[in-house]
């Protein structure tokens, strides 16, 4: 018996179609995914094959306009509208708190909604009592087939769940269900997950029972010969892990933001064994033409985004100071604004220890692309935002060896002076450089803001010591040079939509006045 | 609206079997369980077994195997179950109900048939 | 099998009372517990699933709770109607398997 597992994860409110890099599509020939050119590939291979489930691993919610103004809203509609067959909850579906989770998509999805390892509890319980699963059997063709769910126990860290979800082991949580699962006599068991690509494969090795693991998270890109894009695979699609009792268990992930649908196919014998798989990722190019019917939705439902981003946020008292002349060279309020809305935008009090759980940031200078002038009645809406932010990323956040900081600040002024944008604006740290010494031994004074302390003061920076960090996913990445975060972050997890977070910052202040109040310094 | 609709009141004797229909109707018959459980006179409820019209699977209490059969016949959203080798104490009213495949709780029951075993 | 163990067995109580059914499993159900009530000559009505989710149109005065293998039925304010027998059931393990039944009477 062949099911086709069709996939999708860390969507990120790319309901329209992009360019390449995932940001704003410019040039509509050559712009990639959206939902609208994602049905017409389902649909077309629900008419050619026989049993098919699509599925969604998790974090529609954040990263675009449209989740800013729809709130969860769109993903359910479009969601449903494309039939989805299960999703899984990922950290981002918390963002909006448990509320924001619950009224605009749990309410209103017509598709199963998926997680073993959340367990309500309190008040919240019988609020929430049946909106999501720990799993779901499908009815495909003459057989079920089993779809048991999962999403990051840091899920506390990353977003905003509130204190009555407690998130569980993901292993410890997942094997009773499978086995429940397994009474039922359901013997095709895919768990549908949003813990990233490691715990993906932890497991297949780990849960018996489990036959496919279909995950997301880490936005891991697999694929089985020459890619069909930029992304470089971490590995063959499906990644085949051997499980303790000996089995073969395919894990599949499809990269990011609608750019691809996962394409695998798995083959049973008659006793629910895989016994064979093979697929790839399904590049969704302007070759696949966009379902008009669905464009046309997605259409109707733009016009409210186009009003949204002319309307004021908040106000400003002050020029906010996003000009290269400054970001590039010194601290520049903009700077310290944005970090600020980093730090405000993570606030997660988790443990009475630790007033909070990261109080750093860093920004590189040369993704702060335009000022914006108090004189226009200080007003700041997303269109003035969008112009200090353009590139549609995310501020993540990420754990790092005080060393790694240490080469990252010697890095930020290795060639001082030439405009260029690795120029580190900060927050929750104090700098000081000496441009007399030479590159790579410029930083005599790096201090940082304490977490563990009822009163936050600036200590000096210990080299041995981990470090959680808010930063854009340019620098995780190992953007404007970075390489060493990259090579040495010991743990990333992706963040809200930038904008989205300063909008969110601004909104709530309503009205700001950053100053440059000596973070940056040069002896 | 959902509604289970089961055949009337059998009196067979000890060795007989007996036959008793399910005709679902107000749902997709396919895509739920049919479960059937009995109450003997002044007892409690024993569940006897499951089938999932979708497939024809089906899931039996130990204690019955052999002796119950279910089958379903989906032109009609029929669902039957046969119960063979009476004895006094198979005496009982037995009950349809539907259940979802995943979660056997049971959300809609049939009115109830009356089976007396009698020599 | 899963052994589900209900008390008391029978209660007497007056209109207005507040009434507490108990139910322990033999193991732990993860959960998988539904309440039911049954009137004289009729089929079993579902209350609650999942130990607290109420069906639609049952009254809110009927509330589950509990984990691992102790759950509880509570009536806050009994009302006439709601004389009957009540029986749990668990759902995690087959055979699925109620509990022995409570018989509530008017006092």
């Known amino acids: 018996w062949e099911l086709t597992i069709l996939h999708t994860n860390d969507v990120h409110s790319r309901l329209e179609q992009t360019s390449e890099d995932s940001s704003k599509c410019v040039n509509a020939s050559r712009c990639m995914g959206g939902v609208a050119r994602l049905f017409t590939k389902v649909q077309q291979i629900r008419r050619a094959e026989p049993n098919v489930l699509l599925l969604d691993a998790g974090d529609q919610y954040q990263g675009t306009i449209w989740f800013t103004v729809y709130k969860g809203a769109e993903v359910a509609h479009f969601m449903n509208a494309l039939r989805y067959d299960a999703m899984a909850l990922g950290n981002h579906e918390f963002d909006n708190g448990v509320e924001g989770l619950i009224e605009p998509l749990l309410k209103e999805a017509k598709f199963p909604i998926l997680s073993a390892n959340i367990k309500a509890k309190g008040p919240l319980a019988s609020q929430i009592s049946g909106l999501y699963l720990p799993y779901k059997v499908l009815p495909v063709g003459d057989e079920v087939v089993g779809i048991v769910g999962y999403t990051s126990k840091e899920t506390p860290f990353l977003s905003n769940p509130g204190t009555n979800l407690v998130f569980e082991d993901e292993i410890t949580a997942l094997q009773p269900e499978v086995d429940k699962l397994k009474t039922l006599n359901v013997n095709k068991i895919i768990a549908l997950g949003h813990s990233g690509f490691e715990m993906d494969k932890l497991i297949a090795q780990k849960v018996r029972g489990v036959d496919v693991v279909v995950g997301g998270h880490s936005n891991t890109f697999l694929y089985t010969g020459n890619p069909p894009s930029k992304e470089v695979p971490a590995g063959k699609y499906p990644f085949i892990v051997t499980s303790d009792d000996g089995r073969k268990v395919p894990v599949v992930q499809a990269y990011a933001f609608g750019k691809y649908l996962g394409y695998l196919k798995i083959e049973f014998d008659e006793r629910g064994n895989v016994i064979s798989s093979h697929g790839n990722p399904i590049l969704l190019n302007s070759s696949i033409p966009e379902d008009p019917s669905i464009k046309a939705d997605i259409n109707k439902w733009r016009i409210k985004l186009d009003n949204y981003s002319t309307q004021e946020l908040g106000k400003t008292i002050v020029y906010l100071d996003g000009s290269s002349q400054s970001c590039r060279f010194r601290e520049c309020n903009m700077g310290n604004l944005i970090c600020d809305a980093m730090i405000n935008n993570n606030l997660r009090h988790t443990d009475e220890m630790f007033w909070n759980h990261v109080s750093m940031c860093i920004l590189n200078g040369g993704g702060i692309r335009s000022p914006i002038d108090e004189r226009n009645n200080g007003t700041i809406t997303w269109e003035n935002l969008a112009a200090v932010l353009p590139f549609g990323g995310t501020f993540d956040l990420v754990q790092l060896k005080g060393s790694t900081l240490k080469k990252a600040f010697e890095h930020s002024v290795h060639r001082y002076g030439q405009s260029t944008g690795e120029f580190l604006q900060v927050g929750g740290i104090h700098v000081v450089y000496d441009l007399s010494r030479k590159p790579g031994d410029r930083v005599v004074k790096l201090d940082v803001l304490c977490t563990k302390c009822r009163v936050p003061s600036y200590d000096p920076l210990k080299m041995d010591e981990v470090y959680k960090v808010i930063l854009p996913n340019f620098l995780a990445n190992g953007g404007d040079g970075f390489q060493m975060i990259k090579d040495e972050l010991l743990r990333h997890d992706s963040g809200d939509q930038d904008i989205n977070v300063v909008s969110t910052y601004i909104s709530k202040m309503k009205v700001i006045y950053p100053a440059v109040e000596g973070r940056i310094k040069f002896s | 609206q959902v509604q289970l609709v089961q055949s009337g009141a059998e009196v067979k004797k000890p060795g007989a079997s007996v036959k008793v229909s399910c005709k679902a109707s107000g749902y997709t018959f396919t895509t739920y369980n049919i479960h059937w459980v009995r109450q003997a006179p002044g007892q409690g409820l024993e569940w006897m077994g499951a089938i999932f019209p979708g497939n024809g699977h089906i899931s039996y209490n130990q204690k019955f195997k052999g002796r119950v059969t279910m089958t379903v016949d989906t032109s009609t959203s029929t669902v039957y179950m046969e119960l063979s080798s009476l004895r006094s104490e198979d005496t009982a009213v037995y009950y349809c109900?539907?259940?979802?495949?995943?979660?056997?709780?049971?959300?809609?029951w049939g009115q109830g048939t009356l089976v007396t075993v009698s020599s | 099998d899963i052994q589900m163990t209900q008390s008391p067995s029978s209660l007497s109580a007056s209109v207005g009372d507040r009434v507490t059914i108990t139910c322990k499993a033999s193991e732990g159900i993860y959960n998988r517990l539904a309440w039911y009530q049954q009137k004289p000559g009729k089929a079993p009505k579902l209350l609650l699933s999942?130990?607290?989710s109420l069906e639609t149109g049952v009254p809110s005065r009927f509330s589950g709770s509990g984990s691992g293998t102790d759950y509880t039925l509570t009536i806050s304010s009994l009302q006439p109607e709601d004389f009957a027998t009540y029986y749990c059931q668990q759902y995690w393990s087959i055979p699925w398997t109620f509990g022995g039944g409570t018989k509530v009477e008017i006092k």
């Open positions: 109900a539907r259940g979802d495949y995943d979660e056997s709780y049971f959300d809609y």
């Open positions: 999942g130990v607290i």
